[in-house]
């Protein structure tokens, strides 16, 4: 079953996604490595990332960044910790103590008392700058993701695994397994299981079949299942939409292309405050839906739905997730209303029973490489529920 | 060659409470990380505690999270170890250890050793 929103999690925002948001686990990277399995180590100190310290690199780090990044586990010869000792320089005689430079400039180190992401923690000053840096190959490439959905946080669910990007299918697709793949991306909880054809059919290969999530793993792939089977095909790749992916609507007008604005979000449509609704977010919104552009910004009516969602655009971009953005769950937007639009593509301002948008099969891009087929008017919400 | 001499161990009942102090006759007493390790009878050294050049950043085996704080003097060239609601599982010989290149977290950073102090949780 889906996780409550936790409760540190109500008022977030897009800036807040460098931090620990919810699924993350460990604040690692690897960089200047053949694949993104292997390289030199880098944790993330408030906005920069740096070099984790090598003298203090073991077996138990290796292991927790490999499994945390996905990557199987950590080869043999990542796992060599530094034989011997940096030996200290010779005193100097009526020498000062240089430890306030060295210190400054102390590299953090991953300390790890054993080989889970959860047993990890990042200190900073550890070690001198001027020491060796932890690297790692991790045995396995192995990677998640979510295609065709809209964003990175609703799609249909896909596993590298041994070069190849695949589909699981949907057989015993439920709750749990989303919710697994939710946290494993970082996007919360899971809101929808779906089953196949809910998003465009993947092409490469079935990865896995059986899939059966206690909901409780940290990876897909430590969830027990099949691999995929011959008698499984495209129609029936599983799907999920988690919590921290974001959908609009316009509702309560003539069409699909007026209305109030509504984003669904962490489980429930909630209004978006008119206080911060300009026209660089109208014209985002309604080209996003396929509406052409903002024509108005009609007066807001009081908020009805849960939530408050600000956005702020350059007018640029493709969606509004793309702007910044702001959640705040725990108080009324301060004298505001809720925002509406009235987009170029609506019948109210063409007189028209049908919006400017044909009603038959159409594309709407929606990110620079994912696009969504809509098969008629009635369903062309980028989230399709 | 720095000398590390510990002092402070001794018997304590379960729930008590002890302060281990290492002293250290090096003058640049604070170019060094420090920490501490422990030995129980019959079991290998393992790592308790340890902290950085100035005490900014510490880290703790997960054993003593909560109930032990490293703590250090630069001025009295001193390291302390307060050791809180102790445990029978406490009971070993305790290393002051120093490091000039990291925190001495795994054995082999380490580039002295104390020779110990004795702490007992018996009631």
């Known amino acids: 079953h889906p996780s409550p929103a936790p409760p540190d999690q109500l008022n977030t925002s897009s800036a807040e996604s460098e931090l620990w948001e919810p699924g993350e686990r460990l604040p690692v990277r690897l960089t200047n490595g053949s694949s993104s399995c292997s390289g030199t180590v880098e944790v993330r100190l408030e906005a920069s990332w740096e070099p984790a310290c090598g003298a203090l690199w073991d077996s138990r780090a290796a292991e927790a960044v490999c499994r945390a990044l996905g990557c199987g586990g950590a080869e043999a010869a990542s796992q060599l910790a530094p034989p011997t000792p940096e030996l200290p320089p010779p005193p100097a005689a009526g020498n000062t103590s240089v430890a306030a430079n060295a210190t400054l400039a102390g590299a953090p180190a991953l300390l790890c008392s054993g080989a889970e992401w959860r047993l990890c923690e990042v200190v900073e000053h550890a070690c001198r700058s001027d020491g060796r840096r932890a690297r790692v190959t991790c045995a396995e490439n192995r990677a998640l993701r979510l295609v065709d959905g809209g964003g990175a946080c609703a799609g249909r669910v896909e596993m590298l695994e041994h070069g190849e990007w695949g589909s699981v299918c949907d057989d015993t697709w439920d709750l749990e397994d989303a919710h697994v793949v939710c946290r494993q991306l970082g996007c919360g909880w899971a809101v929808q299981a779906l089953p196949g054809l809910h998003f465009t059919p993947g092409r490469g290969p079935i990865h896995r079949d059986q899939v059966n999530c206690s909901g409780a793993e940290a990876y897909l792939w430590d969830c027990p299942g099949l691999p995929g089977q011959h008698y499984c095909g495209h129609k029936e790749d599983a799907g999920a939409v988690c919590s921290e992916h974001q959908s609009w609507r316009l509702t309560g007008g003539a069409d699909r292309c007026e209305g109030q604005v509504e984003v669904h979000f962490r489980g429930v449509w909630n209004t978006v405050c008119d206080s911060e609704w300009y026209p660089s977010e109208a014209k985002v919104l309604c080209q996003s839906l396929g509406c052409g552009t903002a024509v108005e910004r009609p007066k807001g009516l009081p908020h009805s739905l849960s939530g408050r969602m600000y956005y702020s655009c350059n007018g640029e971009e493709l969606t509004l997730s793309n702007c910044s953005w702001r959640f705040n769950n725990s108080n009324l937007c301060s004298q505001s209303l809720a925002a509406r639009v009235l987009c170029s593509a609506s019948r109210s301002l063409h007189n028209l029973s049908t919006p400017e948008v044909p009603a038959s099969v159409q594309t709407v891009t929606i990110e620079s490489s994912v696009t969504v087929k809509i098969e008629n008017k009635e369903s062309r919400e980028l989230m399709l529920l | 060659q720095v000398q590390l001499v510990e002092s402070g161990g001794g018997l304590v009942q379960p729930g008590g409470s002890l302060r281990l102090s290492c002293s250290a006759s090096?003058?640049?007493?604070?170019?060094?990380?420090l920490g501490w390790f422990r030995q129980a009878p019959g079991k290998e050294r393992e790592f308790v505690a340890a902290i950085n050049w100035v005490g900014g950043s510490t880290y703790y085996a997960d054993s003593v999270k909560g109930r032990f704080t490293i703590s250090r003097d630069n001025s009295k060239n001193t390291l302390y170890l307060q050791m809180n609601s102790l445990r029978a599982e406490d009971t070993a010989v305790y290393f002051c250890?120093?490091?000039?290149?990291?925190?001495?977290?795994?054995?082999?950073?380490?580039?002295?050793w104390g020779k110990g102090t004795l702490v007992t949780v018996s009631s």
């Open positions: 250890v120093a490091s000039w290149g990291a925190m001495p977290v795994l054995t082999h950073v380490i580039n002295y």
């Open positions: 090096e003058r640049t007493f604070s170019d060094y990380a």
